[in-house]
Interface confidence: medium
């Protein structure tokens, strides 16, 4: 029951907790359970006990064994065993089972990992981040403190997360990796190639000449948070920054979520003063995401005067 | 267009009081990370804060750490910095911005002097 | 925390130079790095991202290079319009940090 596993990497610093919790008046004694020998807690051995705390500094494969603590008080005696395994490092990338810390499960509303066993050691900010063996790029990652944030989670950013850090020792650094499993939980979303609900495809726009006219773009790309959906116009093909025309600018809309739960965007193109020229251009709503590109195309047309006497 | 709109900058006493807010329009508030970063006068640039879409994740600079606070309102498009126990060094102009990992755009930025 | 340096702090140029601005992170950041440029009682404006991405309106004789620690903000030819302060930025661990900024002027 009062018996932890604890594992680590030759070259690495490892610190390991007595398993049986005590007052830090407490004393608390360290042996090597095989040959019953005491622990030192002189600093200058590279395995010594200091408290609750055991350290291996750097840790050798030769370390591996079952550790006895006992905390010592003046009424009672607590006996804990660490089983500690020094593992030689890999040197391809996998990191095999036995060497991964506990599994953490994220979503789109929660996707913190944090470096396992961070806690016992001397470190400073930041850490490093490695997933499946790549150092973290871009800024969907943000590192804070002794976790690491994933914006807008997907089902592919599942995998195998490690932390790096440097323990300090008396002005001494070691390195210090612990690697844990990344899971996504499905939330029910779903992402479809995109579906434009306006304008219609080749659609004819009635406008008046000298007035301001409006377009809007609007497509559904699927359930819940979708990582990359996007609506915009184009103007003969370009994009409308593009098109140098001042008059003409999109805007965008606000995100829209209908009755059945559709994640939806609108981007409305605002034409000011409407000219004759306009009416040559083909407007082209375009709606992207990680499926696909799908385009509705709206001409102008001008707007015949009312007649009153029919 | 996207813009971006500070108030509630001003002159207070040390150990003073503000509440920032910043609103933001022309794009999807509600989508995006928001960051305030400040600048003393004469100065580089200082980040101060972060807010995560949702207001899940909330970060600041050691330096206001305690006393100042972010939020924001989603349903208002603003977001706000509320500042407490305002020191002499807070000195500076206070900016909001979108955050993408990098900052874009910004306020025009909102002065706070503390002085007695 | 990530220390940014920036060199040099200020530098003098004439219109049509190529400028040169080096940023140093105390660490690697892989790519999370960003160039921005200010004019006295403006707000910053957002160059380059990602290390080496031009922001959309940014004139194309802005460029940015590096990855890991090492990162180069240049100016092609330098224009009248270009005499600013220019800073760069972390975004790879909080609390993000700027660079002591570079101010480029006139010769």
């Known amino acids: 029951k009062f018996s932890k596993q604890s594992w680590g990497l030759e070259n690495e610093a490892l610190i390991v907790r007595c398993p049986r919790q005590g007052k830090p008046s407490y004393t608390v004694d360290w042996y090597y359970s095989q040959t019953n020998k005491s622990i030192p807690t002189q600093e200058r051995n590279r395995v010594f006990a200091s408290g609750q705390l055991l350290k291996f500094l750097p840790a050798a494969v030769a370390d591996s064994g079952i550790y006895t603590c006992i905390v010592r008080s003046p009424t009672f005696n607590r006996t804990g065993y660490a089983n500690v395994t020094i593992y030689k490092k890999q040197s391809d990338c996998n990191v095999p089972d036995y060497l991964m810390y506990s599994t953490v499960s994220g979503s789109e509303k929660n996707s913190k990992i944090y470096c396992p066993t961070i806690d016992l050691y001397n470190w400073t900010a930041p850490l490093e981040w490695f997933k499946n063996c790549q150092a973290l790029q871009g800024s969907r990652y943000r590192a804070h403190k002794s976790f690491l944030v994933i914006d807008n989670v997907m089902t592919e950013d599942a995998g195998d997360y490690t932390c790096k850090f440097i323990h300090n020792e008396n002005g001494a650094n070691y390195s210090v990796t612990a690697t844990r499993s990344f899971t996504v939980k499905d939330e029910q979303g779903f992402s479809l190639f995109p579906v434009i609900g306006a304008p219609a495809q080749n659609e004819i726009k009635e406008v008046e000449i000298g007035k301001n006219a409006n377009l809007t773009c609007s497509a559904c790309f699927g359930k819940g948070t979708q990582f990359l959906a996007a609506v915009l116009w184009q103007l003969n093909g370009t994009k409308i920054t593009d098109f140098g025309e001042p008059r003409i600018q999109q805007e965008e809309g606000q995100n829209q979520s209908f009755s059945n739960g559709l994640a939806c965007l609108d981007m409305v193109l605002r034409i000011a003063d409407v000219k004759e020229e306009d009416l040559l251009l083909q407007y082209d709503c375009l709606a992207l995401n990680l499926h696909g590109l799908r385009r509705h195309t709206v001409r102008l047309s001008r707007k015949n005067p009312i007649d009153h006497h029919s | 267009e996207v813009q971006l709109l500070e108030s509630g900058g001003g002159l207070v006493q040390p150990g003073g009081s503000l509440r920032l807010s910043c609103a933001a329009s022309?794009?999807?508030?509600?989508?995006?990370?928001m960051s305030w970063v400040r600048q003393a006068p004469g100065k580089g640039l200082e980040w101060v804060s972060s807010?995560?879409?949702?207001?899940?994740?909330?970060y600041y600079a050691d330096s206001v750490k305690g006393r100042f606070t972010i939020s924001r309102d989603n349903s208002k498009n603003t977001l706000y910095l509320q500042m407490n126990s305002l020191r002499a060094e807070d000195t500076a102009v206070y900016y909001c911005?979108?955050?993408?990992?990098?900052?874009?755009?910004w306020g025009q930025g909102t002065l706070v002097t503390v002085s007695s | 925390d990530i220390q940014m340096t920036q060199s040099p702090s200020s530098l003098s140029a004439s219109v049509g130079d190529r400028v040169t601005i080096t940023c140093r992170a105390s660490?690697?950041?892989?790519?999370?790095l960003s160039w921005y440029q200010q004019k006295p009682g403006k707000a910053p404006k957002l160059l380059i991202y990602?290390?080496?991405s031009l922001q959309s309106g940014v004139p194309s004789r802005f460029s940015g290079s590096g990855s890991g620690t090492d990162f180069t903000l240049t100016i092609s030819s330098l224009q009248p319009e270009d005499f600013a302060t220019y800073y760069c930025?972390?975004?790879?661990?909080?609390?993000?940090?700027f660079g002591q900024g570079t101010k480029v002027e006139i010769k």
């Open positions: 660490r690697a950041i892989g790519n999370n």
């Open positions: 911005a979108r955050d993408q990992g990098w900052f874009d755009p």
């Open positions: 022309g794009f999807t508030f509600s989508s995006y990370w």
């Open positions: 807010i995560s879409s949702s207001s899940s994740y909330i």
């Open positions: 930025q972390q975004s790879y661990s909080t609390p993000y940090t």
């Open positions: 990602t290390a080496s």
